[in-house]
Interface confidence: medium
């Protein structure tokens, strides 16, 4: 059998970093090792291209100002998966200044139903649902450097955590036959 | 504007850990911080339930021994997304002893086409395609502790990297109208 890697160690205490130790709001170096390369993660990699094309930020609410498209095969032959899908989605930039990466691209289904490939139109006989995936991020939170209850201005503790990120949509039979 | 977190630092040199420093093949503690909780990542969390139900391991080849199901609404009303989808998929356990986590659940589309919701049968007029997502993992590789070219037995260097993991399938219009 291959060797057991064991479970990650559990450290109860989090180090509190001063403003001086954190250059320009960056996370501590030991949490940002060379090879992590967060920009390789798809929800991060997509941000730059979305910003370049002027995609909207969060807080408009799901599907705000969106419309389930009428799908025309000749228009999507060369398109990406999210546009060719019969449960199409778009990407929205989610921003959180207390998270690294601060900006993530999250998927939003454009249709409640799915698109009938033959007619190109939405059908309520099927449902579009999000596919969620876990993403490892760094979270920062104010902390106290002197042991008191009050946070020290500009000081932060950091920890890694998994968050659920919608990465796309798939088309399913509804749970109810109604 | 929220503060810039900057890019992860780049460290050219990787520390080479001896067998004594690595208890039972575990990764170094600083790479397995408390809050990483890899077992929360979906491709990891699914492994235990898959093993419990006797799912097959890798290396049988994609779709080996699988079949595109006939979808019957009454049978999948309470099923999970991967079974209710008209581009259904199953999970396979991918094992790599030089990666942490060693075991990951990866999605495999069960159909080349998609399932016609009305007939329950596969149609070639549409394609099932994988949705890929990035997952941060630890990678270990043999290394030399004495500066020579030959690796020291039982010694490993570690780095983190993003790998592309199929997390589900979606149904798309084909790229070609043929």
């Amino acid at each position: 059998d291959p060797p057991s890697w064991g479970k990650p160690r559990s450290h109860r205490t989090l180090r509190c970093y001063s403003a001086e130790e954190l250059s320009h709001g960056q996370a501590p170096p030991h949490l940002l090792t060379r090879s992590a390369r967060w920009e390789q993660a798809l929800p991060v990699a997509l941000v730059a291209s979305l910003e370049a094309t002027g995609h909207r930020r969060q807080h408009e609410g799901p599907l705000a100002g969106t419309q389930c498209p009428v799908l025309r095969p000749e228009e999507v032959l060369e398109a990406d998966t999210h546009e060719r899908s019969i449960s199409p989605w778009r990407y929205r930039i989610d921003t959180d200044e207390n998270r690294y990466p601060q900006k993530l691209a999250v998927a939003e289904c454009l249709c409640r139903g799915c698109i009938n490939a033959k007619t190109g139109r939405e059908t309520a006989a099927l449902n579009s649902v999000q596919l969620l995936q876990s993403l490892l991020v760094l979270r920062r939170q104010p902390c106290s450097r002197d042991g008191t209850a009050d946070p020290t201005p500009g000081s932060f503790a950091f920890h890694t955590e998994f968050i659920r990120v919608p990465v796309g949509c798939t088309c399913v039979l509804p749970r109810s036959t109604q | 504007d929220p503060p810039s977190w900057g890019k992860p630092r780049s460290h050219r040199t990787l520390r080479c850990y001896s067998a004594e420093e690595l208890s039972h093949g575990q990764a170094p503690p600083h790479l397995l911080t408390r809050s990483a909780r890899w077992e929360q990542a979906l491709p990891v969390a699914l492994v235990a339930s898959l093993e419990a139900t006797g799912h097959r391991r890798q290396h049988e080849g994609p779709l080996a021994g699988t079949q595109c199901p006939v979808l019957r609404p009454e049978e999948v009303l309470e099923a999970d997304t991967h079974e209710r989808s008209i581009s259904p998929w199953r999970y396979r356990i991918d094992t790599d002893e030089n990666r942490y986590p060693q075991k990951l659940a990866v999605a495999e589309c069960l159909c080349r086409g998609c399932i016609n919701a009305k007939t329950g049968r596969e149609t070639a007029a549409l394609n099932s395609v994988q949705l890929l997502q990035s997952l941060l993992v630890l990678r270990r590789q043999p290394c030399s502790r004495d500066g020579t070219a030959d690796p020291t037995p039982g010694s490993f260097a570690f780095h983190t990297e993003f790998i592309r993991v199929p997390v589900g399938c979606t149904c798309v219009l084909p790229r070609s109208t043929q």
């Epitope: 009428v70 409640r112 139903g113 009938n116 033959k118 939405e122 309520a124 | -």
Partner: antibody
Framework: EVQLVQSGAEVKKPGESLKISCKGS????????IAWVRQMPGKGLEWMGF????????QYSPSFQGQVTISADKSISTAYLQWSSLKASDTAMYYC?????????????WGQGTLVTVSS | DIVLTQSPATLSLSPGERATLSCRAS??????LAWYQQKPGQAPRLLIY???SRATGIPARFSGSGSGTDFTLTISSLEPEDFAVYYC?????????FGQGTKVEIK
Amino acid sequence: EVQLVQSGAEVKKPGESLKISCKGSGYSFNNYWIAWVRQMPGKGLEWMGFIYPSNSATQYSPSFQGQVTISADKSISTAYLQWSSLKASDTAMYYCARDNEYSDSYFDVWGQGTLVTVSS
Amino acid sequence: DIVLTQSPATLSLSPGERATLSCRASQIVSSYLAWYQQKPGQAPRLLIYDASSRATGIPARFSGSGSGTDFTLTISSLEPEDFAVYYCQQSEQVPTTFGQGTKVEIK
């Protein structure tokens, strides 16, 4: 009872505007496409376009694109067909019809029709 | 656009007789074909969809057959209320199109 009820007959002059309506009841109006179909005097049926009341997505027949506008108000379960400038050739019976659940363009419920007469 | 050609244009029959109506498509429409009945002063009514499936409430004397480009609507034994105009319609391609109609009249 599932039904579509259309507004009454209209007599208009060329160049005038017009908006006719189709109100659905007895089913989930928002989740079915509504089609508009034209039947000129003594002639056959011609599909004009669709609207999905849930989000007002539309699809037009190339023959009618730009000639008419299809809209809907989902809050009152009503679809509309309108002209900004009528022509004598618009004289016809106009039907609204419900597309079947799977959007295969089979019309399983029809309105009673609205007769539009355009004459100077 | 797909052109549907119906024949004959008029069919003169007596009650109790069998009526056979034809619809030919200019391109393959698979089984995505429907039949409608329209009586004078009324809206059309869906009879058959998917070439051979009877719509809700349609009597068993109405049946549809065919696939590809050639389709048939059969009325096994004409009732007085069956004399009307019948249209076929394809939904294989957008735009959906109708045939020009076949009138079934009393002989």
